[in-house]
């Protein structure tokens, strides 16, 4: 006979039961897998020279044996010759010193005989009316159980609890939930209505976070805007980690607090998506826009408190990157293009009205024009930037406009709307004698000077009315005064001032006549 099979022959010893009190006892046999079985027993008495035989009789009338030697445990498969679907009777005969001792017989259907297991696999944990509810699938063929739990916190020892009787395909247990500390739970089962039967092993730990996730204590810093129009958000202080019970200190699923970053891009409200949530470990790159950043802590019971920070817009402006041409049909902006098929968001807002919502327009994805420029145009009728005031313009770009973290700043600049040529004309031009051959010309600042980077320069023009000779004097945009020298006494002059932008010549102010009186000596 093969060792893996039950041997259908007479056993190799005489069947002489000694009837002594010692010998094999507590035989139990059960299924341990879909096709595997196990029998185990105790042996009372001296074990030297004892050979064990697991005997089995089938309902067909045939009997067989497994010789196990000194071992008191045997595993066999459903291919070993023992009928697992029909009733069999099993016992152990232990042979030593020419005598045989028998265990009591057990009669069962092996396939249906299952050793009670603890809850296995996925134990679902939920919150129910301030308590913890655990639920799991009843192990196969084990409906009808009583269940106990034990639990501990990082600072306490095990406490035992009762889940009550279970009689369904799913079993559950209500357990205490701690508000602010993590807990470790384990469960065990035994056959219902068999108080003398042994408990299963304890289940694997079920790690449960506190009901309230901890408040995230973190700090951020944001780097300077790079040449690619993006700046990195970095975490300066990590959130503190939760203290865990002993069995949950490895990679224990269920107890962890996850921290997520919720990013809300305040600029460019016309884009497709304004909010994005991402893991705290994955710190994003941001455009130069203004953002609100929230850190949300959550555990298996849901989100907890959050902390919100405001990241202001990057105020660095590019004075020359934007070219604006105003024609009879309307206005066109030009700027250095990004890659092929880029979507641009053009946002503008009157200076001084930063609290109000900015106006914005999203372009269709566009490729660079032959000069490498991207453009955006609008008609005069649209009224866009039509008022004669200073506007802050920001242009953002993205090849993936629906992905919030892939926007970058192309440029940020200022533009004077409406008829800037006329609106920017300096007023209150005045001339004062300065010396015998010079005058000081003063004027009120142009409206263009309220728009950073827009006013390129003032030009002061002086015309000699006798000779019709004209001289022009450029003046820094920060200055509102110039001294005209080498003038001749008694000659009539006219002076005018204009304010120029990078792309537009301003309109001259009203001519102002003056002359230097001829000095008569006494």
């Amino acid at each position: 006979c093969r060792t893996s099979e039950c041997c259908f022959q007479d056993p190799p010893y005489s069947d002489a039961d000694s009837g002594s009190a010692s010998g094999p006892r507590d035989l139990s046999c059960y299924r341990i897998s879909s096709a595997g079985y196990e029998c185990s027993w105790q042996y009372e008495g001296p074990t030297a020279g004892v050979s064990h035989f697991l005997r089995c009789c089938l309902s067909s009338g045939r009997c067989c044996y497994f010789a196990t030697g000194s071992a008191t445990r045997l595993q066999f498969s459903d291919q070993a010759g023992v009928s697992v679907l029909h009733t069999v009777t099993l016992w152990v005969e232990s042979w030593a010193r020419n005598r045989t001792e028998k265990s009591p017989e057990v009669t069962l259907q092996l396939y249906k005989s299952v050793k009670y297991k603890p809850p296995l696999g996925d134990i679902k944990v939920s919150k129910l009316a301030g308590q913890l509810r655990m639920e799991w699938e009843t192990p196969d063929n084990q409906v009808g159980a009583e269940v106990q739990f034990r639990h501990r916190t990082p600072s306490s020892s095990w406490k035992l609890g009762d889940c009550g009787p279970q009689d369904d395909d799913t079993e559950s247990c209500l357990c205490p939930l701690e508000m602010n500390v993590a807990q470790e739970f384990q469960l065990r089962r035994r056959r219902l209505g068999s108080q003398g039967s042994s408990w299963s092993k304890w289940s694997s730990p079920v790690c449960v976070p506190p009901e309230n996730p901890p408040q995230p204590q973190v700090r951020f810093s944001v780097e300077q805007l790079g040449r690619d129009g993006r700046r990195r958000l970095t975490l300066k202080e990590q959130p503190t980690q939760l203290e865990l019970p002993e069995g949950c200190q490895g990679p224990a699923p269920g107890v962890e607090v996850t921290y997520q970053l919720q990013l809300h891009m305040l600029s460019c409200p016309c884009k497709a998506k304004a909010t994005r949530t991402l893991p705290l470990e994955k710190m994003p790159y941001l455009s130069g826009a203004a953002y609100n950043v929230a850190v949300i802590s959550s555990n298996r019971f849901g989100p907890g408190p959050n902390q919100t920070w405001h990241i202001p817009a990057d105020t660095h402006t590019e004075p020359v990157a934007l070219n604006i041409s105003v024609g009879t049909n309307g206005t066109t902006m030009y700027w250095p293009a990004r890659a092929q098929s880029t979507t641009y968001c053009i946002e503008w807002q009157p200076v001084g009205q930063e609290g109000s919502l900015a106006t914005c327009n999203l372009t269709a994805p566009q490729d660079p024009d032959p000069a490498g420029m991207a453009t955006y145009s609008w008609s005069r009728e649209s009224g866009a930037m039509g008022q004669e005031k200073c506007y802050h313009i920001t242009i953002f770009a993205s090849a993936h406009p629906k992905k919030l973290t892939l926007w970058s700043t192309v440029l940020s600049t200022y533009h004077f709307g409406g008829n800037a040529s006329a609106a920017g004309t300096p007023h209150h031009v005045s001339v004062k004698n300065h010396s015998l051959d010079s005058v000081s010309v003063d004027w009120a600042p142009s409206l263009l000077s309220t728009c950073p980077g827009v006013l390129k320069e003032y030009v002061v023009r002086c015309r000699d009315e006798d000779s019709n000779q004209v001289s022009e004097h450029p003046v820094q945009p920060t200055e509102t005064q110039v001294t005209l020298s080498d003038l001749r006494a008694g000659v009539a002059y006219t002076v005018q001032v204009r304010a120029d932008t990078a792309w537009l010549r301003g309109a001259w102010s009203q001519p102002q006549r003056f002359s230097i009186k001829v000095q008569v000596s006494d």
Epitope: C57, C63, T107
Partner: nanobody, 126 residues
Framework: EVQLVESGGGLVQAGGSLRLSCAAS????????MAWFRQAPGKEREFVAG????????HYVDSVKGRFTISRDNGKNTVYLQMNSLKSEDTAVYYC???????????????????WGQGTQVTVSS
């Protein structure tokens, strides 16, 4: 000397009941599988019911299933046959037999058994 002694037979009306006993001596009773056979006049001895040494398994011939029950009490070294709903065709001499439980625990033929009793008569009248 091994002895198996049957008792409990007698005359009974159809539909009635009887309980047969077989007391064993001179052997370690709990080492033996036990069986009941019967033999009607002019017929061969036939297997009726069998039981393993511990009583965990039983086997019956189809004609008595649901009507007869075999049991044993190892403390009293006795095997029983409870016979209910008796029919006239159950009339026979009933024998108790014992066999060591080696590679089989019952045989449908008498030659597989080591020890036999003298038999007890059961007569069912209609």
């Amino acid at each position: 000397e091994v002895q198996l002694v049957e008792s409990g037979g007698g005359l009974v009306q159809a539909g009635g009941s009887l309980r047969l006993s077989c007391a064993a001596s001179g052997l370690t009773f709990r080492n033996y599988a036990m069986a009941w056979f019967r033999q009607a006049p002019g017929k061969e001895r036939e297997f009726v019911a069998g039981i393993t040494w511990g009583g965990g398994l039983t086997h019956y011939v189809d004609s008595v299933k649901g009507r007869f029950t075999i049991s044993r009490d190892n403390g009293k070294n006795t095997v029983y046959l409870q016979m209910n709903s008796l029919k006239s065709e159950d009339t026979a001499v009933y024998y108790c037999a014992g066999k060591t439980q080696g590679s089989t625990w019952y045989h449908l033929t008498p030659d597989g058994y080591d020890y036999w009793g003298q038999g007890t008569q059961v007569t069912v009248s209609s």
